[in-house]
Interface confidence: medium
């Protein structure tokens, strides 16, 4: 079979958006099944027509309604004949149009009066492509060949830049790049102190506007009273916008403030935020826990706990915990050093412990007291000890 692409030179140049019809002539076959190939891949395209010129002469058409750059390439037609594939000579389809940008100027943020560069590149066909730069509505400089780099010595306010690409088919305009001025960051806000303990505090905050320059670090300044002397200053890399303050004094009033810095310098400090560390939990356990059995139940007594350190703060109620081997257990809070226990089973052994609490929590438990079901009264001692 003889195959040839008709009506097309070896190179076919078409303007973008125009239709193209490639014709393929097949001679010497009665029923050719013409396939079109572009750059080695079969064109899966139903926009094809066949015209029988004679019984052994066919013309196949490949219609491209509106060509674009992606349609450019090497086309040929092929048919199968006796198990072999015959291919036509190729045609090179070139799609011409206004320049196409491969690099456009990008938005920038720069310090005042600092030099910077913007890039622009556009391609044809047709070549050559020349670039003209615009600053706002003013043309700057004459046409330069693509690619083009614009060197700017500096700006003192936000400025718009764009480039224009020209070729024989016309011109194309790039996106507009905005060059912003960098500034000092704004003060942080929403400063919160969380996870307070007697010696640690977690601080979190929201960064203010970064001044279009990456925030590098934040400083947390801590004093024992607003305007008092600085207890500590912690510089933390960001993000995250959090900091753990360690080695604080228990039950103490503090204030903190935060500022953040970018390459140009630090922001103003945010307002002072007061906080107070927790006191210490009681260090001592109640002593001499004992039981007095009465007709109405069981009275438990112990010695009052005296604060060992002022950081413990005022000692609050006592907490009593009891358990029996039948699984019954309970806790009760009492203000004094004496408690009347009800709801327990006198037929079962009873184990009782007591601790003193404050605003932080409960101190250590006392030695457990075992009240035996056979005893009239119990006393402090190791578990399961009995008094006679």
């Amino acid at each position: 079979a003889g195959l040839k692409l008709m009506g097309a030179p070896v190179k076919l140049t078409v303007s973008q958006g125009q239709p193209v019809k490639l014709n393929c002539s097949v001679e010497g076959m009665e029923e050719p099944d013409i396939q079109w190939v572009k750059d080695g891949a079969v064109v899966q395209n139903l926009d094809q027509l066949y015209i029988p010129v004679s019984e052994q002469h066919w013309i196949g058409f490949l219609s491209l309604k509106s060509v674009e750059r992606s349609d450019a390439g090497r086309y040929w037609c092929q048919v199968e004949d006796g198990g072999e594939t015959e291919i036509s000579q190729p045609v090179w389809l070139t799609v011409e149009g206004v320049p196409f940008f491969t690099v456009e100027p990008k938005d920038l943020a720069v310090p005042p009066n600092a030099p910077f560069q913007l890039s622009c590149e556009a391609v044809g066909p047709p070549e050559p492509v020349t670039i003209v730069w615009w600053r706002g509505t003013t043309k700057i400089g004459g046409p330069a060949p693509s690619p083009s780099v614009l060197n700017v010595t500096g700006v003192t306010q936000s400025t718009m830049f764009s480039c224009e690409a020209h070729n024989l088919k016309g011109l194309a305009s790039s996106r507009t790049a905005t060059v912003h001025l960098q500034a000092l960051p704004a003060a942080p806000f929403n400063i919160t102190v969380t996870k307070l303990s007697s010696s640690n505090a977690s601080v979190a905050w929201m960064p203010g506007a970064d001044g279009r320059a990456l925030l590098q670090s934040c400083t947390v300044q801590v004093t024992q009273a607003p305007g008092g002397w600085e207890v500590l200053a912690v510089v933390v890399p960001v993000p995250p916008f959090t900091c753990l303050l360690r080695d604080l004094v228990p039950a103490t009033n503090y204030s903190l403030r935060v500022r953040c810095a970018n390459a140009l310098g630090p922001s103003p400090y945010a307002d002072w935020v007061p906080f107070q560390t927790k006191g210490l939990a009681p260090a001592s356990a109640p002593q001499n826990l004992h039981a007095i059995r009465t007709d109405s139940g069981l009275i438990l007594e112990w010695e009052e706990v005296i604060p060992e350190a002022p950081l413990e703060g005022p000692l609050g109620p006592y907490k009593l915990s009891w358990v029996q081997d039948n699984g019954t257990q309970d806790e009760l809070t009492v203000e004094g050093t004496r408690a009347n226990l009800t709801g327990w089973d006198p037929q079962k052994d009873l184990i009782v412990r007591v601790c003193v609490s404050n605003a932080v929590g409960c101190g250590p438990w006392s030695q457990p007291l075992v009240v035996s079901s056979h005893d009239r009264a119990g006393q402090q001692g190791p578990p399961h000890s009995r008094t006679s």
Partner: antibody, heavy 116, light 108 residues
Framework: EVQLVQSGADVKKPGASLTISCQAS????????ISWVRQKPGKGLEWMGS????????HYGPSFQGHVTISADRSTATAYLQWRSLEASDTAMYYC?????????WGPGTLVTVSS | SYELTQPPSVSVSPGQTARITCSGD??????AYWYQQKSGQAPVLVIY???KRSSGIPERFSGSSSGTMATLTISGAQVEDEADYYC???????????FGGGTKLTVL
């Protein structure tokens, strides 16, 4: 005169197989592709697929790929549309048409009813 | 899968101009074809390759295409033009064809 003669109406149960035919006359069968178009009762047209003039390649619409098979016998100038397992939703009028973009000559249609 | 979108119905008075639109993402690159189907009949090709009138079709039928929209225009619609109209085109890759949902033209 160019004519496409289609097989008669058919009633089948779900799960049954079916082949409907379309015989071309008045032109050289291998000069044109054949397409099949479905039209459900009271609904629009749906392109099912086409077979090339030489019957060597088929194109199917995404909804019909794998559900139907289009074939042709060049010696009898007949195109076929085949189902292995019919569903109630296959109830429709099926047209065979000469061509694939320029659908100029249409058969009268074959009504297929699938009902239990 | 690819879709062509048409308005379900268009109504005009006799002698008025009827416009039926068809939108699809591939229409900037693929030709549109228009088919007319009268009640109980097989469809008929009216317009091919966006704007070419099929043989035997009256001159009042014309077609156009711009961007993702193809339009069938009937200038001075007649009562006998009352029918369902379908646009038809290929998907972006060109490996299968699609009908629009159809537009019922009423000439009151």
């Amino acid at each position: 005169e160019v004519q496409l003669v289609q097989s008669g109406a058919d009633v089948k149960k779900p799960g049954a197989s079916l082949t409907i035919s379309c015989q071309a006359s008045g032109y050289t069968f291998t000069d044109y592709w054949i397409s099949w178009v479905r039209q459900k009762p009271g609904k629009g047209l749906e392109w099912m697929g086409s077979i090339t003039r030489s019957s060597s390649r088929t194109h199917y619409g995404p909804s019909f790929q794998g559900h139907v098979t289009i074939s042709a016998d060049r010696s009898t100038a007949t195109a076929y549309l085949q189902w292995r397992s019919l569903e109630a939703s296959d109830t429709a009028m099926y047209y065979c048409v000469r061509g694939y973009t320029h659908l100029r000559t249409w058969g009268p249609g074959t009504l297929v009813t699938v009902s239990s | 899968s690819y879709e062509l979108t048409q308005p379900p119905s268009v109504s005009v008075s006799p002698g008025q101009t009827a416009r039926i639109t068809c939108s699809g993402d591939a229409l900037p690159k693929k030709y549109a074809y228009w088919y007319q189907q009268k009640s109980g009949q097989a469809p008929v090709l009216v317009i091919y390759e966006d704007s070419k009138r099929s043989s035997g079709i009256p001159e009042r039928f014309s077609g156009s295409s711009s961007g993702t929209m193809a339009t069938l225009t009937i200038s001075g619609a007649q009562v006998e033009d009352e029918a369902d109209y379908y646009c038809y085109s290929a998907n972006q890759r060109g490996n299968y064809m699609v009908f629009g949902g159809g537009t019922k033209l009423t000439v009151l």
